[in-house]
Amino acid sequence: YSNFRKSVDSTGRRQYQVQNGPCSYTFLLPETDSCRSSSSPYMSNAVQRDAPLDYDDSVQRLQVLENILENNTQWLMKLENYIQDNMKKEMVEIQQNVVQNQTAVMIEIGTSLLNQTAAQTRKLTDVEAQVLNQTTRLELQLLQHSISTNKLEKQILDQTSEINKLQNKNSFLEQKVLDMEGKHSEQLQSMKEQKDELQVLVSKQSSVIDELEKKLVTATVNNSLLQKQQHDLMETVNSLLTMMSSPNSKSSVAIRKEEQTTFRDCAEIFKSGLTTSGIYTLTFPNSTEEIKAYCDMDVGGGGWTVIQHREDGSVDFQRTWKEYKEGFGSPLGEYWLGNEFVSQLTGQHRYVLKIQLKDWEGNEAHSLYDHFYLAGEESNYRIHLTGLTGTAGKISSISQPGSDFSTKDSDNDKCICKCSQMLSGGWWFDACGPSNLNGQYYPQKQNTNKFNGIKWYYWKGSGYSLKATTMMIRPADF
């Protein structure tokens, strides 16, 4: 006698029990509940969604699915083995021993088993497909991550290498800079010390020069005074001898004039008995203001007050109106005496002007004007000249009638240009005129075809820059 019973065990799993005589067969089937429902992230028999963003979570879920698949596979294998080993025998016995309805029950069980197996297989296939899908996706992601990681690693390595190189370079340069700073500071210190020493030396030399100049002037004055005194003594001795030799002559008392201590020009100095060329102190007319000038006591009878001299280019003659007014340079070398003094001096008495010139070939020439004066500053120190004689040209190289004086900062010429800026130096420019003795100094072999040189057209022509010039004045009645 056989019967078939379906029940649920304590764990909630379904079991099938077959009673066949003394033997009882119980079949425990795995439940489909262990598979996730369609509400889960992995739907049964559904299209696979994109992999979640969390990589660790995906790996965990994959492991769970792998475990489930392994369990199901093992169970199926056991079931298959069981059916093969046991059911064959039982089915033979059942076929031999049971009636028609038992066969039906067995067929129903078998069908049910087969259906469940098929369903389980389908589900396993689905899970397998999902697992494969997920695995493939994960593999792809891992591959992409790996590639990105490799790239990043390579970039990081390259950058690290570059940074190291730069750091090395930087260290090298820093070291160099430090070395240079050290050397520089040493050099600076050395230069500062040298500068200080030089400044001390210069100041010492300046004071020595000043002292020497003073002594020179004093010596010159003393020398001239001694010469005058000697001259006077000789005259006195001679007159005394004369008086003594003529017994009828009456004794006379020599009344000496008070010694003159201030001079307005070099002619007065010469007449006072000081006949040595050199630097003397002159006093402005009707004033106590003094000025140092060079007195030429040798040329043409002496007594010349030098108002301009060029000889070597040591002094810059591109000066301002104020500088030309007050004078600049050194009376021992190149200098300009000063327009204001010359204007005041020549405005009181009639003066002659002599201009001495030297070229680079060893030639000398001069121009002599028998009347020269400068107007006042209100008339821009306009020059007035008459009566030209001399060897430096039959025509006056200073434009006639006289022009106003112009400097780089005071344009009073008759040119559409600014002559002082174009030709350099302060001068009585016309437009711009045949002369400029205050032009740029050029050395030998560089002194021709010059637009701004020391020019005296009616002696050396255009563009010839002279070697030396001297302008000097003396009273017409000297």
Epitope: K414, C415, I416, C417, M422, C432, G433, K450, S462, G463
Partner: nanobody, 129 residues
Framework: EVQLVESGGGLVQPGGSLRLSCAAS????????IGWFRQAPGKEREGVSA????????YYADSVKGRFTISSDNSKNTVYLQMNSLRPEDTAVYYC??????????????????????WGQGTLVTVSS
């Protein structure tokens, strides 16, 4: 250094033609006026013609008007004097000279000879049959 070099002189028959060139270096013609001067034996140097390239102005002495033509090629920094219908009295050493274009008296058009500070060595022109 400013240099002016004349060329083109020579012997020519009366009525003939010559073209003189003045090549300048050390200056640009835009900023200067170039003049042609001549000096016959025993005579003063005299102005013949001049050109101011910047304004295209030209000057001619009365004795050469209609016969001489002055021109310039600034790209070559050269000034030319085309001399046609030459006469025996045109025989002289011809010089070219330069003056800064701005060195001009108010109201005047041309420059006195003493304003020309750069000179060439000259080229001899002989007009003879």
């Amino acid at each position: 250094e400013v240099q002016l070099v004349e060329s083109g002189g020579g012997l020519v028959q009366p009525g003939g033609s010559l073209r003189l060139s003045c090549a300048a270096s050390g200056i640009t013609l835009d900023d200067y006026a170039i003049g042609w001067f001549r000096q016959a034996p025993g005579k003063e140097r005299e102005g013949v013609s001049a050109i101011r390239s910047s304004g295209g102005s030209t000057y001619y002495a009365d004795s050469v008007k209609g016969r001489f033509t002055i021109s310039s090629d600034n790209s070559k920094n050269t000034v030319y004097l085309q001399m046609n219908s030459l006469r025996p009295e045109d025989t002289a050493v011809y010089y070219c000279a330069a003056v800064p274009a701005g060195r001009l008296r108010y109201g005047e058009q041309w420059y006195p000879i003493y304003e020309y500070d750069a000179w060439g060595q000259g080229t001899l022109v002989t007009v003879s049959s």
